[in-house]
Interface confidence: low
């Protein structure tokens, strides 16, 4: 059936509407649109003849209508007068007519509303306020928003006058919010600007901060007063009942014991006419001296010396406190406190014991901290590190070696080649090296304060030919789906390209394979049994190339779900039962059997001669791989029938 759908049904003035045609018949001669509920030539909007593809405007055509090939009609720049019914007249090729009517409604766009109020400064717990949404508009719905939320349910909130008026009875400071009204009709919704309700309140009882009531002689007293109030309160201070000043803050520098007493803050609201006061009692105590730390050894040697730190001065009936690295003392057998906590002893100091250390004296009010003290722990040298780590060089390049050893004070360095002293520097540089520069390169680090020396030797080979590489692995027996393996191609050589092969092929593309460290390291993530292959690394430079021997990865896996063979489950009485269990596993698993839950033997094969119906039941094979720590099992039901009772049964082995 031919139907008309209006999209949208409610249209705003100035917008457009589409009269969408559904179920348009086939084989049409043409169609025509009319204003109204019937076909009336005087009210024709547009006609269209399919054969000529010609659209002809009618008497009611306004220039705002557009017809589409599917007979749908678009009307633009809608006016109020467009409201109503529209009829489509369809003429089929057999000249049979069909009609359908649709309609839409036109509404005006609403203006932006505004809010008027009967009281701009209501007083808390006393006044009421009435908000009215302007203008009054026909066929409009009125809504209210408080802080962009719909109105809360409250007996103090009342809507009236068709929801145009919102009354707040007995206002409170919590009613200080953003109020908006909204007008709606089927085609538009407009919100007013915010109106902020300014509720006068307070002052509440003032709060004096900080809450601290005990001070030391010589400190500054800085009290601040605050009372919730609108408009903001005016403040006055009284000390022991005597007026001091009209400010929110009271500041007295360098107080003495004589400044002890009662301090009163008074808050006043000039609009509400209310006053509130709060009193705090301040006590000023005499000042103890600032502590400091002395040490019996300012340059202790690591792993040799002990250090005793003492907190000065000594004061009777005083609690001493210690901090290391701004933390309270850690529990350690190398840290010892004296009975009065005044001396902290560090037994056998290490380089990590440098501190800083602070001590403190506890008094009635607070803790007085010493200045921090840092220990100068002499240590090292540690074994030197020679960099870079290359051991093979090509002739003609420059050799630049650097040596470093952790040491305090910093180490002094010497270089030896094949035991012969070269120079006393941290770096060794030899330009344009030849095969003759191959040899043992020794770095010696010396600590002049501790008198200790340490050496590291590095073999340097200068050769155009690269050595045969080898593969090192961080995991010789990885577990499937659990472990990763990192292969590294040795040695590390300068200006060298590293290559990898798996089973004689170049590396496959896989998210589980990752090259790093300049392709020197090949990492296999989440290894699988299929990774148990031959891995070869190669090194090459511009003049030579070499390959390592293959390394075969031994992946531990399984046991998989076992299989019991033969598959038969029905046997004749008197037959032999010979069950074999197999599970894929590396290394081979341990096998055990259970019949009806009762443990049997730890073998791969279970043999029972001349079975009877008493041997009916569940036969379970259990497999265990001690290397992977994993287990698996399978259960098989066996039925034994008396001889000749069931045709087709297995005779057994």
């Amino acid at each position: 059936k031919l139907t008309i759908e209006s999209t949208p049904f409610n249209v705003a003035e100035g917008k457009e509407v589409l009269l969408l045609v559904h179920n348009l018949p086939q084989h049409l001669f043409g169609y025509s649109w009319y204003k109204g509920e019937r076909v009336d030539g005087n009210r024709q909007i547009i006609g269209y003849v399919i054969g000529t593809q010609q659209a002809t405007p009618g008497p009611a055509y306004s220039g705002r209508e557009i017809i589409y090939p599917n007979a749908s009609l678009l009307i633009q720049n809608i006016i109020q007068n467009d409201t109503g019914f529209y009829t489509l007249h369809v003429i089929k090729s057999d000249l049979v007519n069909e009609e359908a009517t649709g309609q839409f409604r036109v509404y005006p766009e609403l203006p932006k509303p505004s809010i008027s109020s009967n009281n701009s400064k209501p007083v808390e717990d006393k006044d009421a306020v009435a908000f009215t949404c302007e203008p009054e508009t026909q066929d409009a719905t009125y809504l209210w928003w408080v802080n962009n939320q719909s109105l809360p349910v409250s007996p103090r909130l009342q809507l009236s006058n068709g929801n145009r008026t919102l009354t707040l009875f007995n206002v409170t400071r919590n009613d200080t919010a953003s109020y908006k009204c909204e007008t709606q009709n089927p085609v538009s919704a407009r919100r007013s600007d915010s109106v902020i309700l300014n509720v006068l309140y307070g002052p509440d009882a003032p709060t004096i901060s900080p809450l601290n009531t005990s001070y030391r002689s010589g400190e500054n007293l800085n009290l601040s007063c605050h009372a919730a109030s609108n408009p903001p309160a005016q403040y006055s201070w009284f000390v022991n009942g005597t007026f001091q000043q009209s400010t929110q803050e009271l500041f007295i520098p360098n107080i003495t014991v004589n400044n002890s007493g009662s301090y009163t803050c008074q808050a006043h609201n000039s609009d509400t006419g209310l006053n509130r006061t709060t009193v705090t009692t301040i006590t000023v105590y005499a000042e103890p001296p600032k502590p400091f730390i002395t040490s019996n050894n300012s340059n202790p040697v690591e792993d040799e010396d002990a250090v005793a730190l003492t907190c000065e001065p000594e004061i009777q009936n005083t609690t001493y406190l210690w901090w290391v690295n701004n933390q309270s003392l850690p529990v350690s057998p190398r840290l010892q406190l004296s009975n009065d906590n005044r001396t902290l002893t560090l037994l056998s100091v290490t380089r990590n014991d440098v501190g800083p250390y602070e001590c403190g004296i506890q008094n009635e009010l607070s803790v007085d901290h010493s200045d921090p003290v840092i220990l100068n722990v002499l240590y090292g040298p540690d074994d030197p590190t020679i960099s870079p780590s290359y051991t093979y060089y090509r002739p003609g390049v420059n050799l630049s070696l650097s040596c470093h050893a952790a040491s305090n004070p910093p180490a002094q360095y010497s270089w030896l080649i094949d035991g012969n002293i070269q120079q006393h520097t941290q770096e060794l540089f030899i330009s344009n090296i030849t095969e003759k520069n191959s040899g043992l390169y020794t770095c010696q680090a010396n600590n002049s304060a501790s008198g200790h020396s340490r050496t590291t030797v590095k073999t340097i080979t200068v050769s155009a030919e690269l050595p045969k590489p080898s593969i090192s692995s961080n995991n010789s027996k990885p577990v499937e789906d659990k472990d990763a393996v990192a292969f590294t191609c040795e040695p590390e050589a300068q200006n060298t390209t590293y290559l990898w092969w798996v089973n004689g092929q170049s590396l496959p593309v896989s998210p589980r394979l990752q090259l790093s460290n300049g392709n020197r390291t090949l990492t296999l993530f989440n290894v699988t049994r299929n990774d148990a292959r031959a891995y070869v690394c190669g090194i090459q430079n511009s003049v030579s190339a070499n390959r390592s021997d293959p390394v075969t990865l031994d992946v531990l896996y399984g046991p998989d779900t076992p299989i019991i063979s033969p598959p038969d489950s029905s046997y004749l009485s008197g037959a032999n039962l010979n069950l074999s269990c197999h599970s894929a596993s590396n290394p081979s698993p341990q096998y055990s059997w259970r019949i009806n839950g009762i443990p049997q033997q730890h073998t791969q094969v279970l043999f029972i001669a001349k079975i009877t119906p008493n041997n009916n039941g569940t036969y379970a094979c259990f497999v265990s791989n001690l290397a992977t720590g994993r287990n698996n099992s399978i259960v098989k039901s066996i039925t034994v029938s008396a001889s000749g009772t069931s045709p087709g049964l297995s005779a057994g082995a």
Epitope: A55, P57, I66, Y68, L74, Q76
Partner: nanobody, 117 residues
Amino acid sequence: QVQLVESGGGLVQPGGSLRLSCAASEFTFSSSYMSWVRQAPGKGLEWVSGINTDGSFTRYADSVKGRFTISRDNAKNTLYLQMNSLKSEDTALYYCAVGGGLGYGPRGQGTQVTVSS
């Protein structure tokens, strides 16, 4: 005299893209509803797409929906048709037209689009 000049047609492989342009002059382009229509060899005129005056309302024939995009630049007096995922059945002479483009309202001379491998 209304002037409409189409350009941007050509030979393209199936799955390819083209962007047609239509330069308008001698009439108030910014206040006119505009359409693209096409005529395949031996076939009648087929409406493809339409766009209202400010470009906020567009419509498409079912055969091109999701593949073609109509747009306009009123400052340049130019209408566009971006054609993606072209098929052999899109081969036709493409016209831009004033209004709904169904027999009333002027058309340009057209630009040929051929989709073939």
